[in-house]
């Protein structure tokens, strides 16, 4: 889209005569008609395909034409076009005599023509005026002309559309060649991408406006380069989000369980040896003569209940002595004189004889233990619940109470992240070990398919009037190849034919 501009400067008709040689009475009241058309090797009559324009009466016989662009735009004359400038043209300028005020072609006598010039050639788009002078036997016309682009059109042919903008679709101004020049703080093909705060982490940070650094889930800090540990992580750190890698001596999901209680608290008294035995637990091995969880109590040797199978302990100066009940013997009453005949197994245990009946062994039913099946099993001692689940004894069975986000008999299953349908616009959700992933349908993108994107440029049949659509798949753009008689980015505008003049 652009404008062909014609500046009339001077017309000389010293004798004041028409093309026929007849003089004008009282003088030649002169106006001009201009026809601009496609290049013709020999300029011939026919439609003015690029446009026409007429002037009012500008003077009598010989006169200079003043620049009247500020007062209504009559000089230079404007011939706008809404197609790609082809670089060549044909121009016809006619000078006519107006006997009266009606300048319409049908109102003038056929011999009112004063002079007619026709030129053709190449003309590039540019700001510089081309000066020309055409002389005939009786008249001389001096004029200049040029082609410039309309607002928002650029390039050698005024075919490149570029509209400066500062909104969601881009932040740019247009260079003289029509290329985009991004406003400060923006980048990308259409200057839609903000330039984040300098140093903002490439993967873990992003921004929606320049000089910003917004952190993706799991990251923190001014530059989004510090991971956020698991919520509740006490004595631990992370190298990726939601981790809780325990410091030395700490354990558990939140690193809040003391695995080195001995070093951190020194609980064992009276020279006892301390052994770490798990989460916040320890065992004190007491020196002789001491007892208690922390070996804090002095004891007689009988206090340690050395006599087994119901034997009673008697303190002596040099130690102790066990008095064994019937059926048992030995230093600690540890040997049995019972056999399977004495039915020694409790709680439904079955008895197996050993050493030709000299002693026996009990095979206990589930939930019972001990040499005579006399002890009930605590089913939670093996800590069967995964992912921090809490074990509860329920009669002969056990049950796991799971933490939020886990399920299953032993809390071994993650609750599906896809259960809440997080993918927008019909995206398909896939559960992953550390979260979820959305597969988006055509026309959508983003982590949750929330971003609308363009689809194959020609798929929407953007070209009108049976034009051919060509797509550039790498840039998702299209170009319409117009049939004869149509112009416009989508070939939607017919080439307008002006009113016919008697050229």
């Amino acid at each position: 889209s652009g404008v062909f501009q014609l500046q009339l400067q001077e017309f000389i008709n010293e004798r004041g005569v028409l093309a026929s040689g007849r003089p004008c009475e009282p003088g030649c009241r002169t106006f001009f008609r201009v026809c601009l058309k496609h290049f013709q090797a020999v300029v011939s009559p026919g439609p003015c395909t690029f446009g026409t324009v007429s002037t009012p009466v500008l003077g009598t016989n010989s006169f200079a034409v003043r620049d009247d662009s500020s007062g209504g735009g009559r000089n230079p004359l404007q011939l706008p076009f809404n197609f790609t400038w082809p670089g060549t043209f044909s121009l016809i300028i006619e000078a006519w005599h107006a006997p009266g005020d009606d300048l319409r072609p049908e109102a003038l006598p056929p011999d009112a023509l004063i002079s007619k010039i026709a030129i053709q050639g190449s003309l590039a788009v540019g700001q510089n005026w081309l000066l020309d002078e055409q002389t005939s036997t009786l008249t001389r016309l001096r004029y200049s002309y040029r082609v410039i682009c309309s607002d928002n059109y650029y390039g050698d042919n005024c075919s490149r559309l570029c509209k400066k903008r500062n909104d969601h679709f881009g932040h740019y101004v247009c260079q003289p060649d029509g290329n985009l020049s991004c406003l400060p703080g923006w980048t990308g093909e259409y200057c839609q991408q903000p330039i984040c705060l300098s140093g903002c982490h490439e993967q873990n940070g992003y921004c929606s406006k320049p000089a910003e650094c917004l952190c993706r889930p799991g990251w923190q800090g001014r530059l989004c380069n510090e991971c956020i540990p698991h919520n509740g992580c006490r004595h631990g750190t992370c190298s990726t989000p939601w981790q809780c890698t325990c410091d030395e001596g700490w354990g558990g999901l939140f690193c809040d369980q003391d695995l080195n209680y001995c070093t951190h608290h020194s609980p064992c008294k009276n020279g006892a040896t301390c052994s770490n035995s798990g989460q916040r637990s320890y065992t004190c091995t007491c020196r002789p003569g001491y007892t208690g969880v922390d070996c804090e109590l002095e004891l007689s040797e009988c206090d340690s209940n050395p006599c087994r199978n119901g034997g009673s302990c008697k303190d002596q100066e040099d130690g102790y002595h066990c008095l064994c009940p019937p059926g048992y013997y030995g230093l600690h009453c540890e040997h049995s004189t019972l056999s399977c005949a004495d039915s020694p197994c409790f709680n439904g245990g079955s008895c197996r004889e050993r050493n030709q009946g000299a002693n026996y062994a009990c095979e206990c039913p589930p939930n019972f233990t001990g040499s005579n099946c006399e002890k009930k099993v605590d089913r939670c001692t093996s800590n069967p619940c995964a992912n921090g689940g809490q074990c509860l004894n329920r009669g002969p069975s056990r049950m796991c109470r799971c933490r939020p986000g886990f399920t299953g008999t032993y809390c071994e299953l993650h609750v599906s992240d896809c259960a809440r349908n997080p993918c927008a616009h019909g995206g398909t959700c896939h559960d992953l070990e550390n979260g979820l992933m959305c597969t988006c349908p055509a026309g959508f993108s983003g982590r949750r398919c929330e971003v609308r994107t363009s689809i194959d440029a020609c798929a929407s049949s953007p070209c009108f009037n049976r034009a051919t659509c060509y797509t550039d798949l790498s840039t998702d753009t299209f170009v319409c190849n117009c049939p004869y008689g149509f112009v416009g980015s989508r070939c939607e505008f017919p080439v307008g034919l002006p009113p016919s003049f008697p050229w």
Epitope: R160, F169, G178, E189, S454, P462, D472, E492
Partner: nanobody
Amino acid sequence: EVQLVESGGGLVQAGGSLRLSCVASGDTSEIYDMGWFRQAPGKEREFVSSIHWGGRGTNYTDSVKGRFTISKDNAKNMVHLQMNSLKPEDTAVYYCAATRLIVYTPTGFRQYFDWGQGTQVTVSS
């Protein structure tokens, strides 16, 4: 951005007719043309028909030519799709779309779409 709301979908027997409507609100001055796409289960979204916002012409995909007619109600910023002689293969979710022509690039024109939420059309045999 342009907001689009479709209506008029439903269940119809083969050979019957339906009229879909789409009303546009928001920055309608940016619209270049409006039209309809459709997506059958398990298939890609495909173009059906479009109408130039300035009244310069209409386009149809080959399979609906002569059966579907697109029109525009300027006063209400609405586009209608009159669907006659419906076939079972026309069953799909029909989406209204507005095209915005943004900028001329070295390779051609880039277009952007705003979409409605879709309306179900079911044609039983």
